[in-house]
Interface confidence: medium
């Protein structure tokens, strides 16, 4: 199915957990924290052993000659982030000794500005798309990605780093948003909400989905994830909604079988490698493009969304896995790790279709298309 | 803490029901085992349930012979022994085994005694 | 099934001596191995994780190291209480060692 509202299509739980770790589900769970009504959480951390926060765990990507590795960005500053007034967040956190500033949570103190100013920018992500008001460019041409669908060796390290739960992809994954934008993808992570609330980052007129992927990318510009922070263009994010639909999807329960296994926060198992791509809608050319930021501390700006139009279809039981499975820290169950929207302030979100045209039936009055700004670069 | 209980002198091919009685800590959050150990020998893990209890494993010697349960609003976690053998035999503990960062790691309980015999 | 093999299965030694026991698994288990002391009549008690990792409250003669398929579990100064047997534990399978007996030289 597509966007609510938008036209056309849209497809995440199950499973029980991986046979080889029947030990693997033990970690402190307990009532979730009550959330604040201040200002909206924020996304994962950038990568490390460590998970040192920041929007998900950015892998260090370095020049050819030296081997990947894995980036603690332990410079950023990391905070607790506030909760979001309609969809409250659970208090989940990482905490890091010796340093107040070093952690930060989904629904919580101090507001997350406090902490990483950054987070306080004009042009913060996630924020709600409304198809009508996009600006249909059609110098956005379909995205290309290359080398997404890995053998089941090497193994990728599947991480719940108290924020999310992570996939670090290994070296080879090229992604293009058109000539000249290449990128090489690092990670990707999951938001979702809890039984009966949807938790995805971005929304559609206001509407929420059950969950939300994002496939994380560095510049082929940079050599490193901290060189890109706050540039315009330095990091890429592809971001799909997850939806409820009638059949397992079987690319996603690769991933959510092995969720018990990684039920305590800080835990990390092997997966077998996987069709990344298939973990994405099947359309690549339509989707809605914007400038915004890390959706966690320390929300840099600069970061190229690319939200998809077509969802990707998960069982109930599949979204149940998802957001019933993971522990955070502090006794408290991983759910609804989500920022709330962020103010556009000016900002225009493109189109690669023409999705004003016919796409939202609940538009009473005729809407003042915004004209597409980019050349398509 | 974890205390087991129902061991005890059994004939083969009969059954028991082993227990185990959780506090001090929030058993509802953790998978749990038993292992057991035949007497003058070693440890052998036997069965696992994930802390929801909606994911059991089993060791090849005891599959389809022992069910692992639990009752999280109990606190307590079982274990129905059926067609018992004399190799069955050994102390059975109930454990809490994987370690796990920041918290407490492993913890057993004191064991209870299955007798297989005629 | 991944099977773990420890050795040696006994060994003699002396307060003060080190002490070595190694464990091998049938396959690569990255980092998945726990080691534990157990003494007659008594639970086993946990003193290392993820091969390296210290149990909170364990004395630091004690240490693992190793990754994939081949680990060690080293006592530096045995003392008195030492005196017990080992167990290596994987925890992707998850199987025990045969186990090690250390007995009074």
């Known amino acids: 199915q597509r966007l609510p509202r938008m036209q056309e299509d849209s497809p995440l739980g199950g499973g029980s957990s991986g046979e080889d770790d029947p030990l693997g589900e033990e970690d402190l769970p307990s009532e979730e924290d009550s959330p604040r009504e201040e200002d909206p959480p924020g996304e994962e951390d950038l990568p490390g052993e460590e998970d040192l926060p920041g929007e998900e765990d950015l892998p260090e990507v370095k020049p050819k000659s030296e081997e990947e590795g894995s980036l603690k960005l332990e410079d950023l500053p990391t905070v607790e982030a506030p909760g979001d007034p309609q969809e409250p967040q659970n208090n989940a956190h990482r905490d890091k000794e010796g340093d107040d500033q070093s952690h930060w949570r989904y629904g919580g103190d101090p507001p997350w500005p406090r902490v990483s100013p950054a987070c306080a920018g004009r042009f913060q992500s996630p924020v709600d798309i409304r198809p009508q008001l996009a600006a249909f460019c059609p110098a956005l041409r379909p995205l290309e990605l290359l080398g997404f669908q890995l053998p089941p060796l090497p193994e990728l390290r599947l991480r719940n780093n108290g924020h999310s739960v992570q996939l670090t992809l290994p070296p080879g994954l090229e992604m293009a948003l058109g000539p000249g934008r290449e990128y090489r993808a690092l990670q990707l992570h999951l938001h979702w909400g809890a039984a009966g609330r949807p938790g995805s980052e971005h929304t559609v007129e206001g509407h929420r989905f059950p969950a939300e992927i994002h496939v994380v990318h560095l510049s082929t510009a940079f050599a490193r994830v901290d060189e890109a922070l706050g540039r315009p263009g330095g990091l890429a994010v592809l971001a799909a909604f997850l939806e409820e639909g009638p059949e397992e999807n079987s690319a996603y329960e690769q991933l959510l079988s092995r969720l018990e296994e990684i039920a305590e926060e800080g835990s990390e198992t092997q997966v077998p490698g996987l069709d990344i791509s298939a973990l994405l809608p099947s359309d690549f050319s339509r989707y809605f493009q914007y400038e915004g930021s890390l959706t966690t501390p320390p929300c840099a700006q600069g970061v190229i969304w690319t939200v998809f139009n077509q969802t990707v279809m998960l069982s109930a039981k599949q979204l149940h896995t998802l957001s019933d499975t993971l522990w955070g820290p502090g006794d408290s169950r991983l759910q609804l790790n989500f920022r709330a929207t962020q103010p556009l302030n000016g900002r225009v979100i493109e189109a690669s279709f023409p999705a004003g045209v016919d796409s939202s039936p609940r538009a009473a009055e005729p809407v003042q298309l915004n004209s597409c700004l980019a050349a398509g670069d | 803490e974890l205390v087991e209980s129902g061991g005890g002198l059994v004939q083969p091919g009969g059954s028991l029901r082993l227990s185990c009685a959780a506090s001090?800590?929030?058993?509802?959050?953790?998978?749990i085992s038993w292992v057991r150990q035949a007497p003058g020998k070693g440890l052998e893990w036997v069965s696992s349930?994930?802390?929801?209890?909606?994911?059991?494993y089993y060791a090849d010697s005891v599959k389809g012979r022992f069910t692992i349960s639990r009752d999280n609003s109990k606190n307590t976690l079982y274990l129905q022994m059926n067609s018992l053998r004399a190799e069955d035999t050994a102390v059975y503990y109930c454990?809490?085994?994987?370690?796990?960062?920041?918290?407490?790691?492993?913890?057993w309980g004191q064991g209870t005694l299955v007798t297989v015999s005629s | 099934d991944i099977q773990m093999t420890q050795s040696p299965s006994s060994l003699s030694a002396s307060v003060g001596d080190r002490v070595t026991i190694t464990c091998r698994a049938s396959?690569?288990?990255?980092?998945?191995l726990a080691w534990y002391q157990q003494k007659p009549g008594k639970a086993p008690k946990l003193l290392i994780y993820?091969?390296?990792s210290l149990q909170s409250g364990v004395p630091s003669r004690f240490s693992g190291s190793g990754s994939g398929t081949d680990f060690t579990l080293t006592i530096s100064s045995l003392q008195p209480e030492d005196f017990a047997t080992y167990y290596c534990?994987?925890?992707?399978?998850?199987?025990f060692g045969q186990g090690t007996k250390v007995e009074i030289k």
């Open positions: 001090g800590f929030t058993f509802s959050s953790y998978g």
């Open positions: 349930i994930s802390y929801s209890g909606s994911n059991t």
């Open positions: 534990f994987q925890y992707s399978g998850p199987t």
């Open positions: 396959q690569d288990i990255s980092n998945r």
């Open positions: 993820d091969a390296n």
């Open positions: 454990a809490r085994m994987k370690p796990m960062r920041g918290y407490s790691g492993a913890v």
